[in-house]
């Protein structure tokens, strides 16, 4: 999906009002310095591409974050404010459902969500130069 035509300000507002709080809740009990940010993004469409990938694609050691509150709100915000997003994602979502594992919070998942927090922070500051 090409995130170029999304309403970035509406998505930012959704992040600030709800998604950020859910990410913090998921990470509660974890020190903010525990994980190094290794994933970055260069502009808002790129940030959303990375956020979608880390949130919804299973990775080694973290089978699925898709049922977490922050993930469901991310999906809804993208579906509302990114034209055509629902249509392009519906088949991918159904494929994901077939291979979903049970919900377990592993250290790998915590690391992945820490990366997500960094990507969202970067999304909210689009004018900052890349480090």
């Amino acid at each position: 999906y090409d995130f170029t035509n999304c309403d970035f300000e509406k998505i930012k507002a959704a992040y600030l009002s709800t998604i950020s709080k859910d990410l913090i809740t998921y990470m509660s009990g974890t020190k903010s310095t525990e994980f190094n940010n290794t994933v970055s993004c260069s502009n808002r469409p790129h940030c959303l591409t990375e956020i979608q990938s880390l949130t919804f694609n299973p990775t080694a050691g973290c089978a699925s974050l898709a049922k977490e509150m922050f993930a469901m709100k991310t999906k809804a915000a993208l579906a509302i404010w990114c034209p055509g997003y629902s249509e392009t994602q519906i088949n991918a979502t159904q494929a994901m459902k077939k291979r979903r594992k049970r919900k377990v919070t592993t250290n790998k998942c915590l690391e992945q969500v820490s990366q997500l927090q960094g990507l969202w922070r970067r999304f909210n500051r689009p004018l900052l130069k890349q480090q």
Epitope: N5, D7, K10, I11, K12, A13, A14, Y15, L16, S17, T18, D22, K67, M69, A71, M72, K73, K75, A76, A77, A79, I80, W81, P83, S86, Q89, I90, T93
Partner: antibody, heavy 121, light 113 residues
């Protein structure tokens, strides 16, 4: 005060198209998204989609893909919703609604009076 | 079939308290999405009654209140008055991409006896 005034009732044949207008006043038209919601007889409310009056950008519920077109004319502060290939189950009251959600989630604080569209052969 | 489930009708005598429930699932209300309530009076434009679960817009009497817990929400009306007779709808959001993202209940008709 904020007002959304919609066009009058329409009767259409199956397969035809209908275009409903919504004239906004009492606020800056280009400052807030306009959504469309409908209510079929005896049914609940159903979200159709939105238009950004500033940019003209739109999005719609999957159900209406390829059938709904949302446009606007900023010079007269009016939003339009056109639904094509009408079927009998499109018979409904269609509402334009202003979105004042500042939290990134749609919140409908002002509604038009509704436009009844009847689809009948 | 609405995503959010409301009782088709409720009734009460003037001065009484009535509640209207709105039941969802883990993909909408249970996921922590806010719930809003709208009042549809016969012959008038619908009106926002409660937003963000329990907040009233200015001009809405404090007889109306909202709450949310788990996968459901409710609207309470105390000191029922004849002019409260209307249809009431809850609204939230849903992460199930195969349906609508902005979702409503089927509506509840309130009759003041």
């Amino acid at each position: 005060q904020v007002q959304l005034v919609q066009s009058g009732a329409e009767v259409k044949k199956p397969g035809a198209s209908v275009k409903v207008s919504c004239k906004a006043s009492g606020y800056i038209f280009t400052g807030d998204y306009m959504h469309w919601v409908r209510q079929a007889p005896g049914q609940g409310l159903e979200w159709m989609g939105w238009i950004n009056p500033n940019s003209g950008g739109t999005n719609h519920a999957r159900k209406f893909q390829g059938r709904v077109t949302m446009t606007r004319d900023t010079s007269i502060s009016t939003a339009y919703m056109e639904l094509s290939r009408l079927r009998s189950d499109d018979t409904a009251v269609y509402y334009c609604v202003r979105d004042r959600g500042t939290s990134g989630w749609p919140l409908f604080d002002y509604w038009g009076q509704g436009t009844l569209v009847t689809v009948s052969s | 079939q609405s995503v959010l489930t409301q009782p088709p009708s409720v009734s009460g005598a003037p001065g009484q308290r009535v509640t209207i429930s709105c039941t969802g699932s883990s993909s909408n209300i249970g996921a922590g999405f806010d719930v809003h309530w709208y009042q549809l009076l016969p012959g008038t434009a619908p009106k926002l009654l409660i937003f963000d679960n329990n907040n009233r817009p200015s001009g809405v009497p404090d007889r109306f209140s909202g709450s949310k817990s788990g996968t459901s929400a409710s609207l309470a009306i105390t000191g029922l008055q004849a002019e409260d007779e209307a249809d009431y709808y809850c609204q939230s959001y849903d992460s199930n991409l195969s349906g609508s993202i902005v979702v409503f209940g089927g509506g509840t008709k309130l009759t003041v006896l």
